[in-house]
């Protein structure tokens, strides 16, 4: 488009910008060490520090761990995002009695209204069920036969809540208290990365039937309960939620009791190969791998260097050129050994052992 030429030219003359053909506009080139928050950054505020998966950038610009909702009585309310922590709340059928930052330290089961009482306000993740004396007429709040009995003498506005067993008094947001061996549930976690010791360090129990709220006799409000990180599929089977723990993915929607987690590519990347509820391959946007020229050299003498193409020919990619120093001396190889026990107890999709070797090389050699 000839009319775009003037815009393109203005980018070429400005080293802090580049021209993005896809969006046909000048984009701000994020400085080294910062990551674009959008496809075509316009200003420095569109660039940010990048955190590892499961960390978010706090107000002070520090990468801080997102809380984890891996305790049995918690579910994820909002996912871990680049600028905010994951938020956990009590499972359906439970409410929070002791709150914690972005989570709940102690969840109790919702009360079931006793004889002669009916539900005034159903329990939520934050509040227990509120009961009131049954009125002569049938109340629309009468959710189950148990809650619709004739009134009896004496009124109890709210029944005593039942703590989850065992009650958790710690405000911890990490998986399991008490050192449960991770390998115990390894066999059931098929979607885990080969070297991940376990996706949630908790012994699994029979899913059985569990109420979305307490399940009194005669109530139809019962459903099968799945382990954390599993959801109930259309066929009524507990199915693993997809994991967004790959580096280039972020969580779009959380793992819910009846739907999988969904993942999407990180800001600054686009999906090249889609997958169910996720993306199989994310590529940097714009794609700049082809623009990087590798100059092979003898690794023992000097490590591979990257030559960037002429300025203005590549979008916001930052190949790391050698600095102008004299060749550095190369030290011996370091091997980073991955604990073979961790991998041997898990279903491993690859036959290769995990090893890190470090030379002046870490090699992960599980032997």
């Amino acid at each position: 488009f000839p009319q775009d030429r003037p815009f393109e030219d203005t980018c070429h003359g400005n080293p802090s910008h580049y021209y993005d053909k896809a969006v046909r506009r000048c984009c701000y080139r994020c400085p080294m060490g910062l990551f674009p928050t959008q496809q075509c950054p316009q200003r420095p505020t569109d660039c940010r520090k990048q955190c590892e998966p499961d960390y978010y950038l706090d107000e002070a610009d520090r990468c801080t761990a997102c809380v984890t909702c891996s305790r049995d009585d918690l579910v994820e309310k909002t996912p871990c995002a680049w600028n905010s922590s994951r938020v956990c709340e009590c499972r359906p059928g439970m409410f929070c009695s002791t709150s914690a930052v972005n989570s709940c330290a102690r969840c109790f089961f919702h009360s079931v209204c006793p004889a002669g009482m009916i539900v005034k306000f159903p329990g939520t993740a934050q509040k227990n069920t509120v009961c009131e004396p049954a009125s002569p007429g049938v109340s629309p709040a009468c959710a189950s036969p148990e809650n619709c009995k004739e009134p009896s003498s004496g009124t109890i506005p709210q029944a005593k809540p039942t703590p989850v067993s065992p009650a958790t008094s710690s405000a911890s947001t990490m998986p399991v208290r008490g050192g449960t061996r991770l390998a115990q549930e390894a066999a059931s976690k098929l979607t885990r990365a080969p070297d991940s010791p376990s996706s949630v360090g908790r012994p699994s129990s029979d899913p059985g039937l569990s109420p979305t709220q307490p399940c009194p006799e005669g109530s139809g409000d019962c459903r099968k309960q799945c382990e954390p990180d599993y959801y109930l599929d259309e066929a009524g089977r507990c199915t693993a939620c997809v994991s967004c723990s790959r580096d280039d993915l972020v969580e779009k929607t959380p793992c819910a009791w009846n739907s999988s987690r969904t993942c999407e590519c990180r800001p600054g990347m686009i999906c090249a190969t889609s997958a169910t509820n996720s993306c199989a391959r994310c590529v940097p946007y714009p794609i700049c791998a082809a623009e990087t020229v590798t100059k092979p050299q003898d690794m023992a003498e000097k490590d591979t260097t990257f030559e960037a193409p002429p300025l203005g020919t590549q979008p916001d990619c930052n190949p790391t050129p050698e600095n102008g120093e004299a060749p550095a001396s190369t030290s011996p190889t370091q091997s980073l050994l991955v604990d073979s026990q961790a991998s041997k107890t898990l279903p491993i999709p690859t036959s290769a052992p995990v090893a890190l070797s470090s030379t002046g090389k870490p090699v992960l050699d599980a032997g």
């Epitope: 060490g33 990551f35 990048q50 955190c51 590892e52 998966p53 499961d54 960390y55 706090d58 520090r62 990468c63 801080t64 761990a65 997102c66 809380v67 984890t68 710690s170 405000a171 911890s172 947001t173 990490m174 998986p175 399991v176 208290r177 008490g178 050192g179 885990r192 990365a193 080969p194 070297d195 991940s196 010791p197 996706s199 360090g201 994991s243 723990s245 790959r246 580096d247 280039d248 940097p284 930052n318 190949p319 790391t320 980073l336 050994l337 991955v338 604990d339 961790a342 991998s343 690859t350 290769a352 052992p353 995990v354 090893a355 890190l356 870490p362 992960l364 050699d365 599980a366």
Partner: antibody, heavy 111, light 107 residues
Amino acid sequence: AAAKPGAAVKMSCKASGYTFTDYWMHWVKQRPGQGLEWIGYINPNTAYTDYNQKFKDKATLTADKSSSTAYMQLRSLTSEDSAVYYCAKKTTQTTWGFPFWGQGTTVTVSS
Amino acid sequence: DIVLTQSPKSMAMSVGERVTLSCKASENVDSFVSWYQQKPGQSPKLLIYGASNRYTGVPDRFAGSGSGRDFTLTISSVQAEDLADYHCGQNYRYPLTFGAGTKLEIK
């Protein structure tokens, strides 16, 4: 590796048995008889790096996806840089710490 | 930066004794604390993650506890092979930091 004051040294960390680009590579320093110090990390997939402020002018982290190798270059060496340097890797549960460590590269700086 | 203070700096124990190592954080780190064992001439080895969870293959005599700012590693019955340095580390906020370590010697 032995090096002279003022020189630079480059060490490497070759990974195998997992997808190199799926995990960030961390580097940790340990001076003789002392504790561990986190230097920084690199996302091998995007070449994104972040450093402990203390090492920003000392270390440069790079990665070569084709050979599944991470590198750390230390410049302007002094006796304070004499230490064992480890590369370390987390699992998918990034908040768990480091189950996987390289065996370490010893750097000795002396004239 | 978050500072982790380990105590004691060193201790000598007899086989079979109970050992308690302390790690205090300068600010809240929730439960994002790991404990590492480092034997002479070796790389650190993960023992405990998430303050209280034993990593795969770690003997059950090792136990971690605590949350917030105070953390403890307990070896219920110390063995000769436990001679090592023990480091605590926080994974809560970057930059990641470690304690100076506790050297455990066997009498």
